[in-house]
C-alpha cells in the first residue's frame, strides 16, 4: 500500500514507503485533497485524474472538470469557470475572451457566415453590453485550457492525447 492511503494501524512499513504511488510520486502523507482536475477515489485510496472518468456516469466528483473538457471539444465554445457553464463564442463575439479569439476573428473576417445578430453588431447596430464585457475580463487567466493535473508530470496536449487515447 502506498503512503497515499491509510494503513490499518496508521503507521507505514519500509515497504509501504518504498512502493511507487499511482501518481508516480513518492509520498508519505494520507492525501485527501487533490490537485485541480483530480478527485480523491476512496476505494483506490489515491488521487485520480478526472480525465479518465469523464465517460462514466460516476457518482464521484468530476462533474465540473468533465463539463469543461466536453465543452472544449466543441468548436466555437469555451467553459467559463466562474459561471460553470459552456458558453457559445458566437453569442459574445466583439466582447469575447481569449478562448474565443480564434473563432470570433475568423467569423468576423467572413460576415457571410455570421448569424444575423452578429452581422448587425458588426455594423454597429447593437451596442456593447457592459455586463458581458465585464464578466469576461481576465477570464483568460482562469486556466480553462489547462491540461489534466498529473502531479509530478508536465505533459503536452499531444502526450496527454497519447496517455488517454
Amino acid at each position: 500500500m502506498s503512503g497515499l492511503g491509510r494503513s490499518r494501524r496508521g503507521g507505514r512499513s519500509r515497504v509501504d514507503q518504498e512502493e511507487r504511488s499511482p501518481q508516480g510520486l513518492w509520498t508519505g502523507v494520507a492525501m485527501r485533497s487533490c490537485p485541480e482536475e483530480q478527485y480523491w477515489d476512496p476505494l483506490l485510496g489515491t488521487c485520480m485524474s478526472c480525465k479518465a472518468i469523464c465517460n462514466h456516469q460516476s457518482q464521484r466528483t468530476c462533474a465540473t472538470f468533465c463539463r469543461s473538457l466536453n465543452c472544449r471539444k466543441e468548436q466555437g465554445r469555451f467553459y467559463d469557470h466562474l459561471l460553470r457553464d459552456c458558453i457559445s463564442c458566437a453569442s459574445i463575439c466583439g466582447q469575447h475572451p481569449k478562448q474565443c479569439a480564434y473563432f470570433c476573428e475568423n467569423k468576423l473576417r467572413s460576415p457571410v457566415n455570421l448569424p444575423p445578430e452578429l452581422r448587425r453588431q458588426r455594423s454597429g447596430e447593437v451596442e456593447n453590453n457592459s455586463d458581458n464585457s465585464g464578466r469576461y475580463q481576465g477570464s483568460e487567466h482562469r486556466g480553462s485550457e489547462a491540461s489534466p493535473a498529473l502531479p509530478g508530470l508536465k505533459l503536452s496536449a499531444d502526450q496527454l492525447a497519447l496517455v488517454y487515447s
Epitope: 499511482p22 501518481q23 476505494l43 483506490l44
Partner: antibody
C-alpha cells in the same frame, strides 16, 4: 465488447515464482485501473492490489506486500501479476478485474488456477 | 479495514421463491455497495453497483436496497440460472473488501 483473457493454469514448486497475465481488449487500456483478486479453493474473494496501466502505479493489500508484483505492458494491453516465494497458501484462482471508478469491478478475467505442490 | 458480513452463509430455495440476502458493513459505506454472482468454476459477475443500480444485462428480478451499513439483495422470483454464490463488496473505502458469500442452493 470488453474482454479480459488470462493465461492458463500453472503448477509450481514451493519457493518458485509464477507470473499470470491478463490481456485486455474492447476498451482503452490506459484509462482503467486493473485489480487482482484471490480465491482459495472453496473460499471467498480476497482483494490483492491494483495497477494503473497509464503510469504503472501500484497499490497492494498489506497482506500481499513483498509477495506480489504487478506490472503492465501498454503495447499489448496486458497486465501481469507475479507471485514470489510460493507456498501451499498461494494455491488459488487469481482473477484480474477492471475497476469502473464507482467502487465496483465491472468485468473479470476467467481466472487462472495456480497450484503449488512439491 | 471495513468488515463485510453476509447472512445467511447458505440457503435452500425453489424456483419461483423470493430470496433475500443481507450484507452488513462494519462502518458507514454510504451507498457504495456492490453485488456479484459466481457460479462454480466461473469468474464472479457484477450484478449490481451503488446499492441498486443493475449492471448491463442483469435481469430486473434482481434488486438492491439499503444505505449506510445495512444492505439487501432480493431476487423476486428465483430462476434455475440463479443458483449460485453471491458476494457483496464495499466500494467506499480503501482497501476494497468482500463479504464471505451466500450460497443459494436448490431445495
Amino acid at each position: 465488447q470488453v474482454q479480459l483473457v488470462q493465461s492458463g493454469a500453472e503448477v509450481k514448486k514451493p519457493g518458485a515464482s509464477v507470473k499470470v497475465s491478463c490481456k485486455a481488449s474492447g476498451y482503452t487500456f490506459t484509462n482503467y485501473v486493473m485489480h487482482w483478486v484471490k480465491q482459495k479453493p472453496g473460499q471467498g474473494l480476497e482483494w490483492m492490489g491494483y495497477i494503473l496501466p497509464y503510469n504503472d502505479g501500484t497499490k497492494y493489500a498489506q497482506k500481499f506486500q513483498g509477495k506480489v508484483t504487478m506490472t503492465s505492458d501498454k503495447s499489448t494491453s496486458t497486465v501481469y501479476m507475479e507471485l514470489s516465494s510460493l507456498t501451499s497458501e498461494d494455491t488459488a484462482v487469481y482473477y484480474c478485474a477492471r475497476y469502473d471508478y464507482e467502487g465496483s469491478f465491472d468485468y473479470w478475467g476467467q481466472g487462472t488456477l495456480v497450484t503449488v505442490s512439491s | 479495514d471495513i468488515q463485510m458480513t453476509q447472512s445467511p452463509s447458505s440457503l435452500s430455495a425453489s424456483v419461483g421463491d423470493r430470496v433475500t440476502i443481507t450484507c452488513r458493513a462494519s462502518q458507514d459505506i454510504s451507498n457504495y455497495l456492490n453485488w456479484y454472482q459466481q457460479k462454480p468454476g466461473k469468474a464472479p459477475k457484477l450484478l449490481m453497483c451503488y446499492t441498486s443500480r443493475l449492471h448491463s444485462g442483469v435481469p430486473s428480478r434482481f434488486s438492491g436496497s439499503g444505505s449506510g451499513t445495512d444492505f439487501t439483495l432480493t431476487i423476486s422470483s428465483l430462476e434455475q440460472e440463479d443458483f449460485a454464490t453471491y458476494y457483496c463488496q464495499q466500494g467506499n473505502t480503501f482497501p476494497p473488501t468482500f463479504g464471505g458469500g451466500t450460497k443459494v442452493e436448490i431445495k
